[in-house]
């Protein structure tokens, strides 16, 4: 029986050209995490395997950094990075847990404008 839950950073926004950390955390289970896959819209970004360590997809090597922990850091963000990201936790003996994060990458001026008019 799968008792675990995935906690994520949820919906997040960041400025174009900046960086963002994607984080998921598996809790409420004693299952062993054997591998975590990070995916974006049917594309593999990176994999962290308990035995083999990190593998970053070649097409993302310049903009993706492993960590912190089992998380992933996206750098030099572009508006095209807006979208859904998934962390897929492969565990033993539970099976697979999936978390979802939605990232919105904003033009710098839009982000600044939005910050100026936040409701206190």
């Amino acid at each position: 029986m799968m008792t675990g839950t995935i906690e994520t950073t949820g919906n997040i926004s960041a400025e174009k050209g900046g960086s963002i950390i994607l984080q998921c955390h598996l809790s409420s289970t004693t299952a062993q995490v054997t591998q975590v896959n990070w995916e974006q819209q049917d594309q593999l970004l990176a994999i962290c395997n308990a035995d083999l360590g990190w593998h970053i997809s070649p097409s993302f090597k310049d903009r993706v950094a492993p960590g912190p922990g089992l998380g992933l850091t996206l750098q030099s963000l572009t508006v095209n990075d807006t979208g859904e990201y998934f962390c897929i936790y492969h565990t033993y003996p539970d099976g697979t847990y999936t978390g979802r994060i939605f990232l919105e990458v904003l033009e710098s001026s839009v982000a600044e404008h939005g910050a100026r008019f936040q409701i206190p």
């Epitope: 049917d42 594309q43 035995d51 083999l52 997809s57």
Partner: antibody, heavy 118, light 107 residues
């Protein structure tokens, strides 16, 4: 350098048994899952069996389930395929392959030919 | 089981030609699609993994694209050493399944 070397193939009668071995070198064997894949003469590739690095997960193709057993000895860096109740349709070249991250098969052995015939 | 359908089953091309091979899965497999090259009497060799990632040491004239159910292997400029049989393979679920192969022959 990663190397996978199969052995144990040969001619066997229908109903007979064979044990294939795959000797691995050049990498940390127990960190990698492994597959057996076969290829009948003049035909395409067919997956046979999978074993995780610690042998905790094992899967078989329906065509060999109950007849073939995959195993590994991590102390000897060796993968095995015990084949029982062999049939003519098991005739093929058998390859072992390494599986990083459970997604792709990055290194393959040279293959060993199994011929099942009376 | 997930069925993998490759097309064409064979093709004739000349050195320098652009060659495209397609692979279709019977259900969505996300990016879990790999491409292999096999020459007669030899073991398969990994070319492309996870749909579009070029395996280390493989020439950049090979590229892969697609996701979901439809995938493509492209050889931008065919070289003499590229005449071989090419297979796609899904690793989305067991049993792992391969396409029937595409034999690339000299025209």
């Amino acid at each position: 350098e990663v190397q996978l070397l199969e052995s144990g193939g040969g001619l066997v009668q229908p109903g007979g048994s064979l044990r294939l071995s795959c000797a691995a070198s050049g990498f940390t064997f127990n960190s990698y899952a492994m597959h057996w894949v076969r290829q009948a003469p003049g035909k395409g590739l067919e997956w046979v069996a999978y074993i995780s690095g610690n042998a905790g997960s094992i899967y078989y193709a329906d065509s060999v389930k109950g007849r073939f057993t995959i195993s590994r000895d991590n102390s000897k860096n060796t993968l095995y395929l015990q084949m029982n109740s062999l049939r003519a349709e098991d005739t093929a070249v058998y390859y072992c392959a390494r599986v990083p991250y459970s997604v792709w098969l990055d290194y393959w052995g040279q293959g060993t030919l199994v011929t099942v015939s009376s | 089981d997930i069925q993998m359908t490759q097309s064409p089953s064979s093709l004739s091309a000349s050195v320098g030609d652009r060659v495209t091979i397609t692979c279709r899965a019977s259900q969505s497999i996300s990016y879990y699609l790999n491409w292999y090259q096999q020459k007669p009497g030899k073991a398969p060799k990994l070319l492309i993994y996870a749909a579009s990632s070029l395996q280390s040491g493989v020439p950049s004239r090979f590229s892969g694209s697609g996701s979901g159910t439809d995938f493509t292997l492209t050889i931008s400029s065919l070289q003499p050493e590229d005449f071989a049989t090419y297979y796609c393979q899904q690793s989305y679920s067991t049993p792992l399944t391969f396409g029937g192969g595409t034999k690339v022959e000299i025209k």
